[in-house]
Interface confidence: low
């Protein structure tokens, strides 16, 4: 394992405290506790973190002191299980405390909630935030870590430290600026959007490890790192994949101190060996640790080596294909994936994995046949339709996006997905379809060579959100099937779903379409969400409604909101005009 082979330490907690330093140690313990006990008040978590930190210091002073030899899971689990209100607040999660390690930690992991019942974070006035920041900077930043971690229980902990550093920098700069709001608000918006994206990307990594196993994650990592570092040797990529898998397994498993420590070691190794990895790492490697790790994770693909030979020679034409495959199946398939991915930065990772799976299936079948070479000779021909399917889909959807713009493109997807899986809750359909719709502005601006990796890998992240939210309360067999059968075929599985003909339309409820004057004070985004929620409900009432019918109703709805928001007596307008709108909509849709 190279980087991660460490000497045995008498005290694991002392070792991590010394490696990470007090500030990072405290921040990571706070993140870990907030991700496990998502409902606990901030003050309770701070108290627990301080107790753990004091204990860690005693172990640094004397590694042989009492309890210093205990594992981190034992120490942290014991501390979490001292929370007095565990049973009342968390119900059956309290049963975890009756278990021994490692089962207790596994039990806590099982109870992480992707959609916790927490109030939406409301941003206070800028002056209020700046005062709080100046009054107690440490508490202010801890609160940020706590609020993000409890809402995103799989957030990549070392990356959250990087976000907190940027959060601090934004307040340090902007609270002294002449126009505090103009300086601060765009920075906070950017951090919020980037944070949501980072959380969703990490959630997919954890789902990949937890649901499909280490082999699936390693395959993903081989493909992605081979695209990013096409000049690196296969052995180098394999080593990075092994180390990266360890880092993410630790973070997804709640071992945040080990994860952060190992991520720092991996960044150090990459920078010490950049000559044999990539020519694009120079700037990243000059940055401080948190920025360096983030930069490496986001670094652009290196240029492909010139004159790479044809893949067919080693993987189709060679007489030794079956011999090489039989000797070490996963290594041979890994080499295939590496060679294919380094030649194709223009493909999505999931497409590369589909190609590798097709290649594997063909070899399994053909290496047992009478004439293996004859059998697998045309294997690359089987790749053509697999490549064309996402290319065509992206082309069509980018054309639609360019024609409609983001909001209406989202609406088209809302209708499409509600018809496919109408049993899914309306908030989930709105959230997921809005995010699916963002693929347009995110990826369609790119040239052809960058569109597919941008679009399809982003869609994998968004569809994973649907999968984890649906798993909490499963309502649709079709969603379960697409989410669980194959990680790399999730998007094609959802794309292939037609209208659910078995769905019994929802009863019409006028209350769902009753609006009030408060809609006028909402931001544009919030108003869009209200309208999109109504659109999903319409489709659930009338799944066979045509595009034209739905468009007419939505246009009427937009006009109604605009009219009443301009009226002197807004509430009366919403009440009277709303009744007319509901009646007209029912007539238009034949409800």
């Amino acid at each position: 394992r190279g980087v991660f082979r460490r000497d045995a330490h008498k005290s694991e907690v002392a070792h991590r405290f010394k490696d990470l330093g007090e500030e990072n140690f405290k921040a990571l313990v706070l993140i870990a506790f907030a991700q496990y006990l998502q409902q606990c008040p901030f003050e309770d978590h701070v108290k627990l973190v301080n107790e753990v930190t004091e204990f860690a210091k005693t172990c640094v002073a004397d590694e042989s002191a009492e309890n210093c030899d205990k594992s981190l899971h034992t120490l942290f689990g014991d501390k979490l299980c001292t929370v007095a209100t565990l049973r009342e607040t968390y119900g059956e999660m309290a049963d975890c405390c009756a278990k021994q390690e490692p089962e207790r930690n596994e039990c806590f992991l099982q109870h992480k909630d992707d959609n916790p019942n927490l109030p939406r974070l409301v941003r206070p006035e800028v002056d209020v935030m700046c005062t709080a920041f100046h009054d107690n900077e440490e508490t202010f930043l801890k609160k940020y870590l706590y609020e993000i971690a409890r809402r995103h229980p799989y957030f990549y902990a070392p990356e959250l430290l990087f976000f907190a550093k940027r959060y601090k920098a934004a307040f340090t700069e902007c609270c002294q600026a002449a126009d505090k709001a103009a300086c601060l608000l765009p920075k906070l918006d950017e951090l919020r959007d980037e944070g949501k994206a980072s959380s969703a990307k990490q959630r997919l990594k954890c789902a990949s490890l937890q649901k499909f196993g280490e082999r699936a994650f390693k395959a993903w990592a081989v493909a992605r790192l081979s695209q990013r570092f096409p000049k690196a040797e296969f052995a180098e990529v394999s080593k990075l994949v092994t180390d990266l898998t360890k880092v993410h397994t630790e973070c997804c498993h709640g071992d945040l101190l080990e994860c952060a420590d190992d991520r720092a070691d991996l960044a150090k190794y990459i920078c010490e060996n950049q000559d044999s990895i990539s020519s694009k790492l120079k700037e990243c490697c000059e940055k401080p640790l948190l920025e360096k790790s983030h930069c490496i994770a986001e670094v652009e693909n290196d240029e492909m080596p010139a004159d790479l030979p044809s893949l067919a020679a080693d993987f189709v034409e060679s007489k030794d294909v079956c011999k090489n495959y039989a000797e070490a199946k996963d290594v041979f398939l890994g080499m295939f994936l590496y060679e294919y991915a380094r030649r194709h930065p223009d493909y999505s990772v999931v497409l590369l994995l589909r190609l590798a799976k097709t290649y594997e299936t063909t070899l399994e079948k053909c290496c047992a046949a009478a004439d293996p070479h004859e059998c697998y000779a045309k294997v690359f021909d089987e790749f053509k339709p697999l490549v064309e399917e996402p290319q065509n889909l992206i082309k069509q959807n980018c054309e639609l996006f360019e024609q409609l713009g983001e909001y209406k493109f989202q609406n088209a997807l809302l209708v499409r997905y509600t018809k496919k899986v109408p049993q899914v809750s309306t908030p989930t359909l709105v959230e997921v379809s809005r995010n699916l719709g963002k693929v347009g502005s995110k990826c369609c601006k790119h040239p052809e060579a960058k569109r597919m990796p941008c679009a399809e890998d982003y869609l994998s992240v968004v569809l994973n959100q649907l999968c984890v939210l649906h798993e909490k309360t499963p309502v649709s067999d079709r969603v379960t099937k697409c989410c669980t059968e194959s990680l790399v075929n999730r998007r094609p599985c959802f794309s292939a779903l037609e209208v659910d003909e078995t769905y019994v339309p929802k009863e019409f409820n006028a209350e769902t379409f009753t609006f009030h004057a408060d809609i006028c004070t909402l931001s544009e985004k919030e108003r869009q969400i209200k309208k999109q929620t109504a659109l999903v409900e319409l489709v659930k009432h009338k799944p066979k409604a045509t595009k034209e019918q739905l468009k007419a109703v939505m246009d009427d709805f937009a006009a109604f909101v605009e009219k009443c928001c301009k009226a002197d007596d807004k509430e009366t307008c919403f009440a009277e005009e709303g009744k007319k709108l509901v009646a007209a909509s029912q007539a238009a849709l034949g409800l």
């Epitope: 089962e103 596994e106 992991l109 099982q110 937890q210 196993g213 280490e214 082999r215 059968e485």
Partner: nanobody, 126 residues
Framework: EVQLLESGGGLVQPGGSLRLSCAAS????????VAWFRQAPGKEREFVAG????????YYADSVKGRFTISRDNSKNTLYLQMNSLRPEDTAVYYC???????????????????WGQGTLVTVSS
């Protein structure tokens, strides 16, 4: 390729106990997610209990929680199902199933398990 062989089924009175075993060969059992399913006459195959690959994270169907315990002995490459407080409705053929790739989480969907044993019959009757 994983081969699975169940044993330990039989006739038992209501309230009694049985311990099923599933011996695996061809792959280390701790590298696969393994589960017990059961199928009663005329009914669909249903998930009973499961354990993740690489870590001992366990899952149970609501109908058996508190009565059944799944475990594995890596040194013997064997999966177990300890069944206590048995009821007549537990009567079924019990199957052991494996899903390689070290998934940490067990799936409850039978179709996702490529490897199956031949089953062992458990009859609960007075």
């Amino acid at each position: 390729e994983v081969q699975l062989l169940e044993s330990g089924g039989g006739l038992v009175q209501p309230g009694g106990s049985l311990r099923l075993s599933c011996a695996a060969s061809g792959r280390y059992i701790d590298e696969t997610a393994v589960a017990w399913f059961r199928q009663a006459p005329g009914k669909e195959r249903e998930f009973v209990a499961g354990i993740g690959g690489g870590v001992d994270i366990t899952y149970y169907a609501d109908s058996v929680k508190g009565r059944f315990t799944i475990s594995r002995d890596n040194s013997k490459n064997t999966l177990y199902l300890q069944m206590n407080s048995l009821r007549p409705e537990d009567t079924a053929v019990y199957y052991c199933a494996a899903r390689p790739g070290r998934p940490l989480i067990t799936e409850k969907v039978a179709d996702l398990y490529p490897y199956w044993g031949q089953g062992t019959l458990v009859t609960v009757s007075s």
